[in-house]
């Protein structure tokens, strides 16, 4: 039996801060789990993941490419990303795996959130030439 | 046939580090339903789980050892891992692997065990 | 960490007898009517080996007189009639929670 996952398909980002939820099919606090996003069409880089259960909130650690922390309730996971750059623009795939107790419970790969980090363009005001 | 096979054990010096393997055949370490974990057994002594990896490649540890341990696998090879830092006198042990199943996470094949003796 | 306290610690016995075994965790390690508890036994110098998954259900390949019983917290591993080569350490695992724990032992030595 796999899980169902639901993630918004594009987030677009010009304040280099977002937040992502995986909204799942699954009662969070029946059992242990770890959640993790991963980045990349083949979820390449684990770039978030935290691990909790029914007893106590999880303490989310990140990739040292990325600033990440993360909260649930019962049926979501929100991951938050901040100091993103435009080189962070891709697909990011929300992953949960329940372990304990058994039997162990996977999610079934969703379309993935393409999240878009907008380039800042800084305006300079060019000043005619005084003749 | 499933077989487990661990190698890697020996005299190492208090201080020091641990890396042993474990063969796998009979069935890939990769595909969903198994993972394989890793118990130990000091001289006379009861068994100790230390950790776990399924899969997907997530691992899970022992508390008590979590600081010093890393389970890690090379799907290419079928092969897993233990890396096992900082020995101490009380790390002496029979080191075995062994597969679960999904289901119950019961133990239903293990190794032969590899002989670690951690003094100087 | 659940605890699992196994008794006897060790027991003497003779071939054809009876023998019972039981664990006693430190909290249910039941989850939706199935009990994660596990029994194993290990001769001297070998590994150990899988005799009763989920407290009740023969492994493949073990003999008929091995039987497992109980829910909850306690659990009981009987042996009908003790066979010469059923000498050996016994064990109980449970795996309902992280981190995996094993009772201490029950050694099984003729009598």
């Known amino acids: 039996n796999k899980i169902l996952v639901k993630q918004s398909p594009l987030l677009v980002v010009d304040s280099n801060e977002v937040s992502l939820s995986c909204r799942y099919s699954y009662n969070l606090l029946a059992k242990e789990f770890r959640a993790s996003l991963y980045k990349g069409v083949n979820s390449d880089v684990e770039v978030c993941v935290g691990n909790g259960n029914f007893t106590y909130q999880p303490q989310f650690r990140s990739n040292a490419e990325f600033n990440c922390d993360g909260d649930f309730d019962n049926e979501t996971v929100t991951f938050r990303l901040w100091n993103l750059h435009v080189n962070h623009t891709d697909i990011y795939f929300c992953k949960i795996e329940f372990m304990y107790p058994p039997p162990y419970l996977d999610n079934e790969r969703s379309n993935g959130t393409i999240i878009h980090i907008k380039e800042k363009h800084l305006c300079h005001t060019q000043s005619s030439p005084k003749l | 046939e499933v077989q487990l096979v661990e190698s890697g054990g020996g005299l190492v010096q208090p201080g020091g580090s641990l890396r042993l393997s474990c063969a796998a055949s009979?069935?890939?370490?990769?595909?969903?339903?198994?993972?394989v974990g890793w118990i130990r057994q000091a001289p006379g002594k009861g068994l100790e789980w230390i950790g776990e990896?399924?899969?997907?490649?997530?691992?899970y540890y022992n508390p008590s050892l979590k600081s010093r341990v890393t389970i890690s696998r090379d799907n290419s090879k079928n092969t897993l891992y233990l890396q096992l830092n900082s020995l101490r006198a009380e790390d002496t042990a029979v080191y075995y692997c062994a597969r679960y199943k999904y289901d119950y996470y019961d133990f239903d094949y293990w190794g032969q065990g590899t002989l670690v003796t951690v003094s100087s | 960490d659940i605890q699992l306290t196994q008794s006897p610690s060790s027991l003497s016995a003779s071939v054809g007898d009876r023998v019972t075994i039981t664990c006693r965790a430190s909290q249910s390690v039941d989850f939706h009517g199935i009990s994660f508890l596990h029994w194993y036994q290990q001769k001297p110098g070998k590994a150990p080996k899988l005799l009763i998954y989920a407290a009740s259900s023969l492994q493949s390949g073990v003999p008929s007189r091995f039987s497992g019983s109980g829910s909850g917290t306690d659990f009981t591993l009987t042996i009908s009639s003790l066979q010469p080569e059923d000498f050996a350490t016994y064990y109980c695992?449970?795996?309902?929670?992280?981190?995996?724990?094993f009772g201490q032992g029950t050694k099984v030595e003729i009598k």
């Open positions: 009979g069935f890939s370490l990769s595909t969903s339903g198994v993972g």
């Open positions: 990896i399924y899969h997907s490649g997530s691992t």
């Open positions: 695992q449970q795996s309902y929670r992280s981190p995996r724990t």
